[in-house]
């Protein structure tokens, strides 16, 4: 049975330019984690297996990097990324935990109400 | 000003398929998420997703998939909720409400468009 | 999915009175940043739903300032502080800070 549950960094607004962590963490398991894949609707973003360690699509190359922990960090962010990310854990003997993100990115000159949520 | 425009009311039959439109007005469209909610029983208020026309992204509640579809026609600032495989449960007022940027709220909403599934 | 509850589900009211609506949350409403996404609604009889408060307290555009929201983590709080006829409705709040994002079950205000 599935007990675990996945806890997100929650919805995030950014800045275009800027960076963001998008981080999920699965709890209430004793299940082990074999690996973490975060996508964005059809596209791979990165693995982190627990044997091999992480592995970024050669398309996000420039932009994504690991961590922290289980986490990613997507840099110069365009208003093209806007989107919903996914944060899959693939465990043992549980199975496939799923959580969700939705990251929204402002145009500088738009930010409205002084909205300017990216990592410095 | 800020308008959302939505497709009149429909009685369909159970098993049907059917699509609501809301056009929008007054705002650079491509700039904002779209979404759709659901009223049943006349109080209920439930997200069904959205749709960010700059790239067509996409978001769903769960609880939904398979029975919506949310699409984007730039070109008409107009989006699109498909329904599909109506069943008694889905007769309901659906909203379309434009987000808020920065604050995942929904500021300027449509003006309902009521769907009765009755055979 | 977060489950959002309001209470009371019936407000009772004489105009002029000073009210409040809670809403709390399954899960804590701050996003990693610190920034939280609650909002709430007034659905008047055959209108469409419009927009309170966004961002807890931020009232919007053309919202009288006798509605005021506070809160933080999972409490929140809409308070009218002089009720006029046209406050009368349901009123909603809205988590947007998870996937996906959960309305409260109503609140009537009502006259007494």
């Known amino acids: 049975m599935m007990t675990g549950t996945i806890e997100t960094t929650g919805n995030i607004s950014a800045e275009k330019g800027g960076s963001i962590i998008l981080q999920c963490h699965l709890s209430s398991t004793t299940a082990q984690v074999t690996q973490v894949n975060w996508e964005q609707q059809d596209q791979l973003l990165a693995i982190c297996n627990a044997d091999l360690g992480w592995h970024i699509s050669p398309s996000f190359k420039d932009r994504v990097a690991p961590g922290p922990g289980l986490g990613l960090t997507l840099q110069s962010l365009t208003v093209n990324d806007t989107g919903e990310y996914f944060c899959i854990y693939h465990t043992y003997p549980d199975g496939t935990y799923t959580g969700r993100i939705f990251l929204e990115v402002l145009e500088s000159s738009v930010a409205e109400h002084g909205a300017r949520f990216q990592i410095p | 000003e800020v308008q959302l425009q939505q497709s009149g009311p429909e009685l369909v039959k159970p098993g049907v398929s059917m699509k609501i439109s809301c056009k929008a007005s007054?705002?650079?469209?491509?700039?904002?998420?779209m979404n759709w909610v659901k009223q049943s029983h006349g109080k209920n208020l439930e997200w069904l997703g959205l749709i960010f026309p700059y790239n067509s992204a996409t978001s769903y509640n769960q609880k939904f998939t398979g029975k919506a579809t949310i699409t984007v026609d730039k070109s008409s600032n107009t989006t699109y909720m498909e329904l599909f495989s109506l069943t008694s449960e889905d007769s309901a007022v659906y909203y379309c409400a434009r987000g808020l940027r920065g604050f995942f709220a929904l500021d300027y909403w449509g003006q309902g468009t009521s769907v009765t599934v009755s055979s | 999915d977060v489950v959002m509850t309001q209470t009371p589900l019936s407000l009772p009211v004489s105009f002029g009175d000073q009210v409040s609506i809670s809403c709390r949350s399954s899960?804590?409403?701050?996003?990693?940043?610190?920034?939280?996404?609650l909002s709430w609604y007034l659905h008047k009889p055959g209108q469409s739903p419009h927009l309170l408060i966004y961002g807890i307290s931020n009232r919007f555009s053309g919202v009288p300032d006798r509605f005021s929201g506070s809160g933080s983590g999972t409490d929140f709080t809409l308070k009218i502080s002089t009720i006029k006829p046209e406050d009368l409705g349901m009123y909603y709040c809205?988590?947007?800070?998870?996937?996906?994002?959960?309305f409260g079950g109503g609140t009537k205000l009502e006259i007494k």
């Open positions: 899960q804590s409403l701050a996003n990693s940043y610190g920034n939280t996404y």
């Open positions: 007054g705002y650079s469209f491509t700039g904002y998420t």
């Open positions: 809205l988590q947007g800070i998870h996937q996906p994002w959960t």
